[in-house]
Interface confidence: low
């Protein structure tokens, strides 16, 4: 007996061939001997089966002795043995219809679980293997679970169902909802404008939800909500914004925030959360701000940084085109009685300069100039 595997919702074509290459009488029946369809001369006739409106044949093939049974919009319950009667012969075809669905929405938040459920006909014992977009293979029976979805799990999952040494392939598009970056750090000189960007790692037709940026300034004892906003069909509207600092928010995606100027009291860490409509849980992105200030007071030239710096970062003070006068893994360095010239304060990581502030030291009778 020939076995054919079909996919729920798809169309299948069961073949039946006569030895004579001409149009002759044929009938397709199910295992209960109920007629599905056949012919009367050049006309297609249908029987009283449940497939009535979904069954068809390809009349153009009859003259070649081919009498296919086409079943559209397959259902699991269409799984059956179908019998083609032609030229006093009977050809039997076993059709097994499978379905594979994601347990919930195919748009899932980063960190959530994906469960794929296989629908199969009674008596079948299929095995399933799925391959994620990042090439990870998972095997299972009626259900397959993947916990802690990552950004790389976004894309097309290819699942193969094996039964009777035949296979059928399913493709399911999964969208992992997340920000492109889990964390970012911005380095700015005091007084500079600060741009924070929160690009999303997915695109959807309509995006609705609400968000908030909580900020923990290094100098503050507790965190503070800097801005709350709504997102409606990808359009951003601010609900509440603190007076200090007065953030400006872009009205279009990607989410974009502007801090008019970097000040030591703003240095710290923020957490932007985005709650999407009809989704449980929130998207998160951490953002950090490091602020540098170079000053000269009387005979002391000081360079300071505020904010979440790594212990391996080096802070240096050097006269332009000269060796560093002072270089420490600390958040403040200074030089007493600095000589006149353009001094550079540098924050660097393994020799790579992350932030630089210049201050001009004038001869002792003058006051310093900050370019």
């Amino acid at each position: 007996k020939k076995v054919v595997l079909g996919k729920k919702g798809d169309t299948v074509e069961l073949t039946c061939t006569a030895s004579q290459k001409k149009s002759i009488q044929f009938h397709w029946k199910n295992s209960n001997q109920i007629k599905i369809l056949g012919n009367q001369g050049s006309f297609l006739t249908k029987g009283p089966s449940k497939l009535n409106d979904r069954a068809d044949s390809r009349r153009s093939l009859w003259d070649q002795g081919n009498f296919p049974l086409i079943i559209k919009n397959l259902k699991i319950e269409d799984s059956d043995t179908y019998i083609c009667e032609v030229e006093d012969q009977k050809e039997e075809v076993q059709l097994l219809v499978f379905g594979l669905t994601a347990n919930s929405d195919t748009h899932l938040l980063q960190g959530q679980s994906l469960t794929l459920t296989l629908e199969s006909p009674p008596g079948s014992s299929p095995s399933v293997q799925c391959r994620s977009p990042r090439g990870k293979n998972i095997q299972g029976g009626k259900t397959l679970s993947v916990s802690q979805l990552e950004l790389q799990d976004s894309g097309t999952w290819t699942c193969t169902v094996l039964q009777n040494q035949k296979k059928v392939e399913f493709k399911i598009d999964i969208v992992v909802l997340a920000f492109q970056k889990a964390s970012s750090i911005v380095y700015k000189k005091e007084g500079e404008q600060v741009e924070f960007s929160f690009p999303l790692a997915f695109t959807v037709e309509k995006l609705t939800g609400s968000g908030e940026l909580w900020w923990q300034a290094e100098r503050a004892s507790s965190s503070k909500s800097w801005i709350t906003f709504d997102l409606k069909n990808k359009e951003v509207s601010v609900k509440r914004v603190t007076q200090d600092p007065k953030l400006q928010m872009g009205k279009k995606l990607p989410l974009h925030l502007t801090l008019p100027q970097a000040l030591p009291q703003y240095a710290g860490s923020g957490n932007l959360t985005l709650a999407l409509e009809a989704k449980t849980g929130k998207l998160h992105q951490e953002v950090n701000l490091v602020v540098m200030r170079a000053t000269q007071l009387q005979k002391n030239l000081t360079c300071e940084v505020w904010g979440p710096t790594s212990p391996k970062l080096m802070l240096s003070l050097k006269l332009e085109n000269k060796e560093a006068k002072v270089s420490k893994r600390e958040k403040a360095v200074w030089v007493l009685n600095p000589e006149a010239g353009m001094w550079q304060c540098l924050l660097s990581d393994s020799g790579q300069v992350l932030l630089e502030s210049n201050i001009k030291v004038l001869p002792t009778w003058s006051t310093p100039v900050q370019p």
Partner: antibody
């Protein structure tokens, strides 16, 4: 020099169509939302439509929805306004303008305008 | 749509005068408002963005203030070239809405 130059205006009968163009130069056109704004004779300014950097989002004032279509060709640094089913009340000078990057930043660069007259 | 009410619709003043034009929004719009100057036969020119930020190249005699629903444009000392029509623009949400305009004339 940052510049916007409109063209395509003219006299058209009610119910007719017209296509306005705006050529941009001196800035990265594909990085900006763009708007069309019009001004009827002796009247104030009215925002008509705008379009996202990549053309994927478009917004219109209610009075032109379904009749006007804003589009852009970033390869040609050009903005367009296809105007169909024109009415007498569409008579105006049409300006193309560069949208500011953030809400509240308005439109910072404008063209000189092109005149559309709808009359029988 | 949010309505913008600009006043006065016209204003006569002399060179050296200090003048203020106001715009009121029908609901709170933070500081998402710009001010424009337009001279006859010319395109509008952005003066103030985000309610109070002076656009590059605009003289410092122009200033803007306000947030929420009430906004104002002030010209501290009128110059001959300032006689024009002024518009406020809300671009907080769609549709963008201009005020009706204020025509500033020489007294």
């Amino acid at each position: 020099e940052v510049q916007l130059v409109e063209s395509g205006g003219g006299l058209v009968q009610p119910g007719g169509s017209l296509r306005l163009s705006c050529a941009a130069s001196g800035f990265t056109f594909s990085s900006y939302w763009m708007s069309w704004v019009r001004q009827a004779p002796g009247k104030g300014l009215e925002w008509v439509a705008n379009i996202k950097e990549d053309g994927s989002e478009k917004y219109y004032v209610d009075s032109v929805k379904g009749r006007f279509t804003i589009s852009r060709d970033n390869a040609k640094n050009s903005l367009y306004l296809q105007m169909n089913s024109l009415r007498a009340e569409d008579t105006a000078v049409y300006y193309c303008a560069r949208d500011g990057s953030y809400s509240g930043y308005g439109m910072d660069v404008w063209g000189q305008g092109t005149t559309v007259t709808v009359s029988s | 749509a949010i309505q913008m009410t600009q006043s006065p619709s016209s204003l006569s003043a002399s060179v050296g005068d200090r003048v203020t034009i106001t715009c009121r929004a029908s609901q709170g719009i933070r500081n998402d408002l710009g001010w424009y100057q337009q001279k006859p036969g010319k395109a509008p020119k952005l003066l103030i963005y985000a309610a109070s930020s002076l656009q590059s190249g605009v003289p410092s005699r122009f200033s803007g203030r306000g947030s929420g629903t009430d906004f104002a444009l002030t010209i501290s000392s009128l110059q001959p070239e300032d006689f024009a029509t002024y518009y406020c623009l809300l671009d907080y949400n769609y549709p963008y809405t201009f005020g009706q305009g204020t025509r500033l004339e020489i007294k």
